[in-house]
């Protein structure tokens, strides 16, 4: 640690005195202190001399000697008082700038330590301090206002009692800056804009911050626009608003608009796109396939995306048949607005019944005209099967009818014994019918197919089963020949139709 001579913490001298402060260290040493006049510095290897031959009250202050090469960063200090009976204060600053909740040091240094008992801090023109001002005093450093607030940004003076009268220092302006959490907050309205050529438009860019020192501008395709700024202060925030008014838009007004605000903390920007169109438009689309297949009893949501300008004047869902003249219940139709010009319309069809298959159309209208988007809904059914015994061209034939959607495939099984359903162990013979005859195939209906199995002689201790399957499920019908005729067994699950 460097050593200062004279080796006293404080030195009191009179104006005009010669002061010589010597600092010695192991390596090179440096003096530092307030920017006061008349000092001369002389360095000589490991010592440095700070001297003046005409001390004034302005030399009052703390002088510190450091050894730059010392890894521990040790320093020594001496405080000099230049005791001027006419000047009790040496003010080191015209202005003090701090952030809110920091301590604000007002650097009026007392030139005579004896005066410490009679010091006080006042606002200029003798006004008292604001309520709740918490401050302390150090003769070496001055007055400290603790946890300074924005409202305490004032002009202050230091007061000392000299011979029974108060002597004021020159004033110090305290600026307490609000802590700026980041760049200004921004809004750009609207987020998207569409106008027909010739219409009027307005774009508003606004920024706000706790501190007045920030800039905001609006740019169009990277060109800064010259727009008059409106300023305001409310809710403890400064607001700056730029409003672009266009009476008759044209194609050159289209493009990207950016609202940019910046302060010492950085920059924020937000953008929007302005589209200028020749005429009104209305576009309908769906992310879904327009041809839908759903299993009976399940639910389906039909969704249509609408892009339109100007806004919609009307819209509705319509059932176009073929089964009934029922119309979708309004409570099942739902509309959500994605943004100003894009909307999603949903029709919910829960627990679909056979009569609800068919065409559903969404219709919308705006000044650009009508548009429609139609979905075709086909229901899927598991096969239903029935078998009868008949004679065709004199031959005994088993006739299997299977009805379902998609079109069922048919397989015949012959198995031993009498059973409702052939299992693997009993199967004697299997016939696949790759091309059953299609009896009916209308849009939105089940497909009915027929398969024939010619049987020369019915074996009485055997069962003939017709099985049909599609992507939804399977169905079967067991035919058991008995002496008194034929007996058929539909499987249990087809005895009850929900």
């Amino acid at each position: 640690i460097p050593v200062i001579e004279p080796s006293v913490p404080e030195l009191v001298v009179k104006p005009g005195a010669t002061v010589t402060l010597r600092c010695v260290g192991n390596g090179s040493v440096e003096w530092d202190g307030p920017p006061s006049p008349h000092w001369t510095l002389y360095s000589d290897g490991s010592s440095s001399i700070l001297s003046t031959n005409n001390a004034t009250f302005q030399n009052t202050g703390t002088y510190r000697c450091t050894e730059p090469g010392d890894p521990l960063g040790g320093s020594a200090a001496i405080h000099l008082y230049v005791k001027d009976p006419a000047r009790p204060w040496n003010v080191l600053a015209q202005e003090v700038v701090v952030f809110e909740d920091q301590d604000a040091l007002l650097p009026c240094l007392l030139t005579d330590p004896v005066l410490e008992a009679g010091v006080s801090l006042v606002r200029v023109r003798g006004r008292p301090l604001m309520r709740h001002t918490n401050y302390s005093f150090s003769p070496w450093h001055g007055f400290t206002i603790h946890r300074a607030k924005f409202i305490q940004s004032q002009d202050y003076q230091c007061s000392a009692l000299m011979g029974g009268r108060k002597v004021m220092s020159i004033s110090i302006r305290l600026k307490v800056q609000k802590v700026i959490p980041g760049p200004p907050a921004l809004t750009l309205v609207p987020a998207e804009l569409v106008r027909i050529r010739g219409e009027a438009a307005q774009i508003v860019c606004s920024a706000s911050s706790v501190d007045v020192n920030f800039d905001v501008f609006l740019q169009h395709n990277n060109t800064k626009l010259a727009i008059p700024q409106q300023s305001d202060f409310h809710n403890n925030r400064y607001q700056k608003v730029l409003t672009l008014n266009l009476d008759q838009v044209d194609f050159q007004h289209a493009g990207n608009y950016s609202c940019v605000a910046s302060n010492v903390q950085g920059k924020h920007s937000t953008s929007m796109f302005f589209r200028v169109v020749e005429s009104a438009y209305l576009n309908l689309s769906s992310e879904q396939n327009l041809i839908q297949e759903v299993t009976v009893g399940e639910g389906l949501n039909l969704k249509v995306m609408v892009e339109a300008y100007p806004g919609l004047q009307g819209f509705n869902w319509t059932y176009l048949g073929p089964f009934s003249d029922h119309q979708p219940e309004p409570k099942l139709a739902n509309a959500t607005t994605k943004d100003t010009y894009r909307h999603t319309f949903t029709l919910s069809l829960p627990r679909l019944k056979p009569s609800e298959a068919g065409r559903y159309s969404f219709l919308a209208r705006n000044p650009g005209g009508w548009r429609a988007l139609t979905f075709e809904l086909t229901l899927r059914y598991p096969p239903e099967v029935s078998v009868i015994w008949t004679f065709i061209n004199g031959s005994g034939t088993l006739l299997c009818a299977a009805s379902g959607y998609p079109q069922p495939n048919v397989t015949w099984l012959q198995c031993s014994g009498h059973t409702d359903r052939c299992d693997e162990a009993q199967v004697l013979q299997v016939w696949d019918d790759p091309y059953p005859e299609v009896l009916s195939q209308e849009p939105f209906h089940k497909v009915t197919v027929q398969s024939l199995l010619t049987v020369e002689t019915l074996e009485h201790n055997q069962t003939y089963e017709c099985r049909a399957h599609n992507s939804v499920g399977s169905g079967s019908w067991a035919f058991i020949p008995i002496s008194a005729g034929a007996h058929t067994h539909p499987p249990d699950e087809f005895l009850f139709t929900p």
Epitope: E30, W31, D32, G33, P34, P35, S36, P37, H38, W39, T40, L41, Y42, L50, N54, Y63, R64, L92, A93, Q94, E95, V96, V97, V98, Q102, A104, L105, P107
Partner: antibody, heavy 117, light 110 residues
């Protein structure tokens, strides 16, 4: 080794506020005075003002009404704001450490600020 | 208009001694010490002399400073081509509690 680095916009519009920040590295900002000095192209140096780490400031009287300096010891930074700028404020702006004896021992490399619309 | 007055230019040949003057008033040079800065083209100024005649470490002893009354001078002996630069004097000015500079002297090494 103490190093200083000025940062801020290189272009400012007339009547707007010029804002610069000086970041100190290689040493602490504390317990020193820090100054801003400017130099118009082809001209001499002009002292703008100084700030101590406690926030105490002194400004050149010719600029005092337009200048605000502040310090952020937590970031080892100090800053300059010059309001209502005109073309006459176009210059290279330097930040520097000021020592007892009123000399500047460390300087930033300088940043050119142009005032133009 | 600079507060301290310096000649706008000075020149010398390699090996020569050159002196640059700086004159002020009682509120600056008259009552405070003088500092000198060297500014090479395109760079920041560099401290050359402080407290009238003190050289920071790294500055060659070819550079020396002196002060008398309200004037000061910088002397460069054994002039070298790398000394070609602008030189500024500076001092505290009591009337503004700040630093004032000279207008600068452009030194050309012929």
């Amino acid at each position: 080794q103490v190093q200083l680095q000025e940062s801020g916009p290189g272009l400012v519009k007339p009547s707007e506020t010029l804002s610069l920040t000086c970041t100190v590295s290689g040493g602490s900002i504390s317990s020193y005075y820090w100054s801003w000095i400017r130099q118009p192209a082809g001209k001499g140096l002009e002292w703008i003002g100084r700030i101590y780490t406690s926030g105490s400031t002194n400004y050149n009287p010719s600029l005092k009404s337009r200048v605000t300096m502040s310090v952020d010891t937590s970031k080892n930074q100090f800053s300059l704001k010059l309001s209502s700028v005109t073309a006459a404020d176009t210059a290279v702006y330097y930040c520097a450490r000021e020592r007892l004896g009123m000399f500047f021992d460390y300087w930033g490399q300088g940043t050119l600020v142009t005032v133009s619309s | 208009q600079s507060v301290l007055t310096q000649p706008p230019s000075a020149s010398g040949t390699p090996g020569q001694r050159v002196t640059i003057s700086c004159s002020g008033s009682s509120s600056n040079i008259g009552s405070n010490t003088v500092n000198w800065y060297q500014q090479l083209p395109g760079t920041a100024p560099k401290l050359l002399i402080y407290s009238n005649n003190q050289r920071p470490s790294g500055v060659p002893d070819r550079f020396s400073g002196s002060k008398s009354g309200t004037s000061a001078s910088l002397a460069i002996s054994g002039l070298q081509s790398e000394d070609e630069a602008d030189y500024y004097c500076a001092a505290r000015d009591d009337s503004l509690n700040g630093v004032v500079f000279g207008g600068g002297t452009k030194l050309t090494v012929l």
